[in-house]
Amino acid sequence: EPTMYGEILSPNYPQAYPSEVEKSWDIEVPEGYGIHLYFTHLDIELSENCAYDSVQIISGDTEEGRLCGQRSSNNPHSPIVEEFQVPYNKLQVIFKSDFSNEERFTGFAAYYVATDINECTDFVDVPCSHFCNNFIGGYFCSCPPEYFLHDDMKNCGVNCSGDVFTALIGEIASPNYPKPYPENSRCEYQIRLEKGFQVVVTLRREDFDVEAADSAGNCLDSLVFVAGDRQFGPYCGHGFPGPLNIETKSNALDIIFQTDLTGQKKGWKLRYHGDPMPCPKEDTPNSVWEPAKAKYVFRDVVQITCLDGFEVVEGRVGATSFYSTCQSNGKWSNSKLKCQPVDCGIPESIENGKVEDPESTLFGSVIRYTCEEPYYYMENGGGGEYHCAGNGSWVNEVLGPELPKCVPVCGVPREPFEEKQR
Amino acid sequence: IIGGSDADIKNFPWQVFFDNPWAGGALINEYWVLTAAHVVEGNREPTMYVGSTSVQTSRLAKSKMLTPEHVFIHPGWKLLEVPEGRTNFDNDIALVRLKDPVKMGPTVSPICLPGTSSDYNLMDGDLGLISGWGRTEKRDRAVRLKAARLPVAPLRKCKEVKVEKPTADAEAYVFTPNMICAGGEKGMDSCKGDSGGAFAVQDPNDKTKFYAAGLVSWGPQCGTYGLYTRVKNYVDWIMKTMQENSTPRED
């Protein structure tokens, strides 16, 4: 259990300590305190480097001191013959004696007290990025105006995150731009546009000045753009090194500006706007797009009309055209629909006639109806030839879709009548 | 047929056989048979056969039987209480509408109707063919089809022949322009049982075809001159009747 103070005495003190002793004491004071260890009496066999008998003071892995011999106070007002101040809350004291003592030595008497440490000054590494405030048993960090203390309670940064930009056009700059940006900050800006618009970022070279990269090429301060699974950057240096126009192909963009503790520059300024998501002009054979444009963007609607003799088949129903919309993901709706050749189907049978099976029943195919000669003939003309028309009907040049009519040939006997002479 | 020769149905594929009364008719298309009014006036549901030279019962079983749907008698035909005493055969023409269409082939095919032009006006001496299973010189009814070629004659030739078994005064018999007189050569003539059959004349505009210029109607005496219904005078009535009683399938 940690204690605020305590006493440590060598074995048999104030009598002579025995030979061949090794004893250790673990001192622990509450966290946030250091330890002041002082000796009021010291009488230990003297040897070079205290090799025979000694009292050792260890802090962690470091030996703070090793004592032997006799000491007396230099100050008539103070009984302290030796003292140690450590800024840690743990300390180990080890007493060792060898196998023989030429004289009678009385050992040592020591006391420890918990002392306040000044974390703000006592360490090489400054605990706070900005202002350090010491108090008994601890310290706290504080920040200049407009800065806030991060969750680590040590670092200060500017409150530059959480902004969400939803307007179709806007401007974003680093904090204090064009004055130097704050050190030790992570600024996150979110652009969230309506689906169907892609964020396009525009920067001018002269509007960018960020602490340059180290010798290994790593940015110390950096600007990064993240759009979904795509990343642009990190960027740093004097003058913007990336493309001046960044087409993100996404409606959501995160801008992350990370700075370290040193080397603040003027920062950066950018403009962004939302471009309607483009849809590629797809190659749809046997069709015409209306309206015809060089570029199609989100919410554009086109009517795709099949050329004569072609149709789009959806759910086994044929149509000559369909509508397609440029969607928010940059893809066309109804993209599976295609204009395919019209199929006129199996030609109808006719009474007293026949139709030869065509090679194909698709647009442009030709069929020929014939009547059962010599007993029937084609009454309504047209020659019997039909082609598969664009409307899905078998059509004759004379009769249109009307089928030929095979009617009986009249008045023709198969064999002429011959009178038998009597 | 008196004075005729044996014929094959292939010579007269339009020939229709009526078994009650024993008579004839002419097929004019898939759905219609033309016959004499006096043939069907007493039996409005006649049984008809096509495609067979012989009308032997066993042969008829193998031939095509036609079922009537309706009989249309010319409105000018006078219906009598006692048909046996008839002296007026004017408008002796009727149409029989068939239930099902007839399939044409070498033994069954229609005869043409006369055109309305003057080309189809008959002249004396024009030859026509008659056929049927009616009385012959030897028997009351022929089993095999008989036929004869005979010329058109002036109507007076028919008037001059004495009626064999008159049922009234000779003057009572009516002769009209709706009748054709034909025969008088080598005793060739139609006779009882041939009624309704066609008097087939070669088409003046297409020598390969025959048209029904007349229908066997009546006569004063078999083996002399016979009277035939002049079909040309009824073409409008025939066309109108067929048109008004057709199905869309025929239109």
Epitope: G345, S349, K354, D357, P358 | -
Partner: antibody, heavy 118, light 109 residues
Framework: EVMLVESGGGLVKPGGSLRLSCAAS????????MSWVRQAPGKGLEWVAT????????YELDSVDGRFTISRDNSKDTLYLQMNSLRAEDTALYYC???????????WGQGTLVTVSS | QIVLTQSPATLSLSPGERATLSCTAS???????LHWYQQKPGKAPKLWIY???NLASGVPSRFSGSGSGTDYTLTISSLQPEDFATYYC??????????FGQGTKLEIK
């Protein structure tokens, strides 16, 4: 007289095969497109397949496509339906029918019963 | 696929009454390709009316058919005992050759 006579039906286990025949007479068979239509017990009519007059074009119901094949032999005036991978739901009376103008079925056979059951 | 829906499923009427059978298509059908069949128990169907309004051979004139687009009707002006049967409508469309309605059973009341 037009006549269509079906044969080849019977009891078959699921997964089995049958070949139905339809003998035509009384008309020029090779002049007409033909169809098979089925009727499950107590149910309505369901078109199964159609074949063109010469036999080179066929259409089949989606649910039988790949399992059933319609064919014809014009020299024998016969229509066929080869049925493979039969299922219980194929149980029906199978009719053959002649296709007339506007693809109306003007003559039907009396049907042959196919029962698919284990 | 064009679906044909017939109504009513069953129609109970007495001889002499007028019968009206309806057939509704899920999308437009050409009137030339809409047909009706009559089927009696244990018998094969018979073509009854073809191309919407044309009576098949042997069908009495008390039967008539009408309609266009998606709505078609078979009417019997005065029912006779032999008319009681099941009637099916049927359509042909080149992209899906043939579909039938589920049938209307006309029964004696």
């Amino acid at each position: 007289e037009v006549m269509l006579v079906e044969s080849g039906g019977g009891l078959v286990k699921p997964g089995g095969s049958l070949r139905l025949s339809c003998a035509a007479s009384g008309f020029t068979f090779s002049n007409y497109a033909m169809s098979w239509v089925r009727q499950a017990p107590g149910k309505g009519l369901e078109w199964v397949a159609t074949i063109s007059s010469g036999g080179s074009h066929t259409y089949e119901l989606d649910s039988v496509d790949g399992r059933f094949t319609i064919s014809r032999d014009n020299s024998k005036d016969t229509l066929y339906l080869q049925m493979n991978s039969l299922r219980a739901e194929d149980t029906a009376l199978y009719y053959c029918a002649r296709l007339f103008t506007k693809h109306a079925m003007d003559y039907w056979g009396q049907g042959t019963l196919v029962t698919v059951s284990s | 696929q064009i679906v044909l829906t017939q109504s009513p499923a069953t129609l109970s009427l007495s001889p002499g009454e007028r019968a009206t059978l309806s057939c509704t298509a899920s999308s437009e059908v050409s009137s030339s390709y809409l047909h009706w069949y009559q089927q009696k128990p244990g018998k094969a169907p018979k073509l009854w009316i073809y191309s919407t309004s044309n009576l098949a051979s042997g069908v009495p004139s008390r039967f008539s058919g009408s309609g266009s687009g998606t709505d078609y009707t078979l009417t019997i002006s005065s029912l006779q005992p032999e008319d009681f049967a099941t009637y099916y409508c049927h359509q042909y469309y080149r992209l899906h050759p043939i579909t039938f309605g589920q049938g209307t059973k006309l029964e004696i009341k």
